[in-house]
């Protein structure tokens, strides 16, 4: 998977008046990394691993960047005409990626009241707008505002892309990100299903990076896809991920089944417990 940095900023208006604060979150490699603390007007790391990425360096640069981005987005919202009464939001999501072959991608997306209305591929300078008339009107509105100085706009987006990649590379220089390996905790549980059947669930949690193989085996052979149910691989809020896989088996056949896990070149197998729960840390 590529390394990525994702900025998510939201500004609000009430009865046509743009509010002074803004909401901001930054994700690094899909993990919550920074957020903007509105009370302290500072960028704050999300969890210990985020603090470890920069070590003892301050977060002044991140604070400055987010503050500037928030200001720009408030100005954009102010130029959206025909804002109805009540609460409205303008959200900007910016993503830059560095792929294994060192190629880069960068994109930007605008949402009004949670609805996407404008996207840009920064490298190709290609803008796309959804078909709906509301999206078309909003996009025209925002693009006209952004195009007031066409050259400045072009330079602005390329600079923004370059800044994003520069920040991403700076974070990646930290061995915490590049060499980070956190083995999963694996636990297998069982629950009664229909008569004569039980559901066995294998959960892997607190692992990093995101890529993982988790599958049920019968007599050492992987079960077919259609007999297993998988959960998404999701961030667990601690800079690590979690996922699960479940299958239904006949009561009395538990000994034939194991959960197989593979992560970062290491693997383990986990039996179905005879009682209710079994928690095993994979010690590599």
């Amino acid at each position: 998977e590529p390394h990525s940095l994702r900025y998510n900023l939201t500004v609000l208006s009430w009865d046509g008046s743009v509010q002074s604060g803004f909401l901001a979150e930054v994700h690094l490699d899909g993990q919550p990394f920074l957020r903007y603390d509105r009370q302290k007007c500072r960028a704050k790391p999300q969890g210990q691993w985020a603090e470890d990425v920069l070590g003892n360096k301050t977060w002044d640069r991140e604070t400055r960047d987010l503050t500037g981005n928030g200001k720009d987005l408030r100005m954009t919202l102010a130029h959206i005409k025909d804002q109805k009464e009540g609460l409205h939001s303008l959200q900007e999501i910016r993503v830059c990626e560095i792929h294994e072959d060192n190629s880069t991608r960068s994109s930007q997306h605008f949402y009004y009241d949670g609805e996407l209305f404008l996207s840009q591929n920064v490298e190709t300078e290609e803008w796309t707008v959804p078909q709906s008339s509301r999206a078309q009107t909003l996009a025209m509105n925002v693009r006209n505002f952004l195009k007031e100085d066409a050259m400045k706009t072009k330079t602005h987006y390329h600079a923004m892309h370059a800044d994003c990649l520069q920040e991403l590379r700076r974070y990646l220089e930290s061995s915490v990100v590049l060499r980070r390996r956190v083995p999963p905790m694996v636990n297998v549980t069982r629950s009664e299903a229909s008569e004569g059947n039980i559901t066995v669930t294998c959960r892997a949690s607190s692992f990093y990076p995101r890529n993982i193989t988790l599958t049920w085996r019968q007599d050492g052979v992987s079960l077919s896809h259609d007999t297993q149910q998988w959960g998404d691989v999701l961030p667990d809020g601690n800079g690590t991920y979690q996922t699960w896989v479940a299958t239904r088996i006949c009561q009395g056949e538990e000994q034939r089944f194991t959960c197989y896990m593979e992560h970062s070149g290491n693997h383990s197998t986990h039996p179905v417990p005879s009682g209710k729960v079994l928690v095993l840390q994979s010690h590599w």
């Epitope: 050492g220 992987s222 693997h267 197998t269 039996p271």
Partner: antibody
Framework: QVQLVQSGAEVKKPGASVKVSCKAS????????FYWVRQAPGQGLEWIGY????????VYNQKFKGKATLTVDKSTSTAYMELRSLRSDDTAVYYC???????????WGQGTLVTVSS | DIQMTQSPSSLSASVGDRVTITCRAS??????LNWYQQTPGKAVKLLIY???RLHSGVPSRFSGSGSGTDYTLTISSLQPEDIATYFC?????????FGQGTKLEIK
């Protein structure tokens, strides 16, 4: 490539025990189960049991419970099958096999002839 | 235990012939059937797993079919190197059980 190399032929007296080894190479030893099978002279194949080399879990054919014990030594990537209280009808070729997680008994050892004779 | 009845127990065929070997299970085995080749002095080889899936490196002249209790191994055009004993295995229910084997010879 996956290779399973079994120990050499054994001649044992009735009542004795024998331990057959199966050394694996060409893959991560603890990834896949080991299965043991026997073939008596002029007979078909019989499944004895299997072992998960990661945590040592075993499943036996009821017929061989108390007769066969399956173990592994991770440090040498070797699976073992010990047979006790040998009788003349335990004379057979004993095979180990492993899997690729897609199929049972995917790769086989060359077999070990155990002869039980007084 | 599930009984696996394999037939014929031996057969003689000419190079280029189409050869069919069958295995019948004493109860439904839900396609969990493998076919193996046993040649004297060589390790046993997996040919087909889960009724019809060809194991990697196995020539395409080998194929498998069947469902429920009846399963078939077919060699579309017999080659001299196919001289061996063939047997089936059911992997659906413990204990795993094998067919008695079919000894294939060249006429």
């Amino acid at each position: 490539q996956v290779q399973l190399v079994q120990s050499g032929a054994e001649v044992k007296k009735p009542g004795a025990s024998v331990k057959v080894s199966c050394k694996a190479s060409g893959y991560a030893f603890t990834k896949y189960n080991f299965y043991w099978v026997r073939q008596a002279p002029g007979q078909g194949l019989e499944w004895i049991g299997y072992i998960d080399p990661y945590f040592g879990g075993t499943v036996y054919n009821q017929k061989f419970k108390g007769k066969a014990t399956l173990t592994v030594d991770k440090s040498t990537s070797t699976a073992y099958m010990e047979l006790r209280s040998l009788r003349s009808d335990d004379t057979a070729v004993y095979y180990c096999a492993t899997t690729d997680a897609y199929s049972l008994f995917t790769y086989w050892g060359q077999g070990t002839l155990v002869t039980v004779s007084s | 235990d599930i009984q696996m009845t394999q037939s014929p127990s031996s057969l003689s065929a000419s190079v280029g012939d189409r050869v069919t070997i069958t295995c019948r299970a004493s109860q439904d085995i839900s396609n969990y059937l493998n076919w193996y080749q046993q040649t004297p002095g060589k390790a046993v080889k997996l040919l087909i797993y889960y009724t019809s899936r060809l194991h990697s490196g196995v020539p395409s002249r080998f194929s498998g079919s069947g469902s429920g209790t009846d399963y078939t191994l077919t060699i579309s055009s017999l080659q001299p190197e196919d001289i061996a004993t063939y047997f089936c295995l059911q992997g659906n229910t413990l204990p795993f059980t094998f067919g008695q084997g079919t000894k294939l010879e060249i006429k």
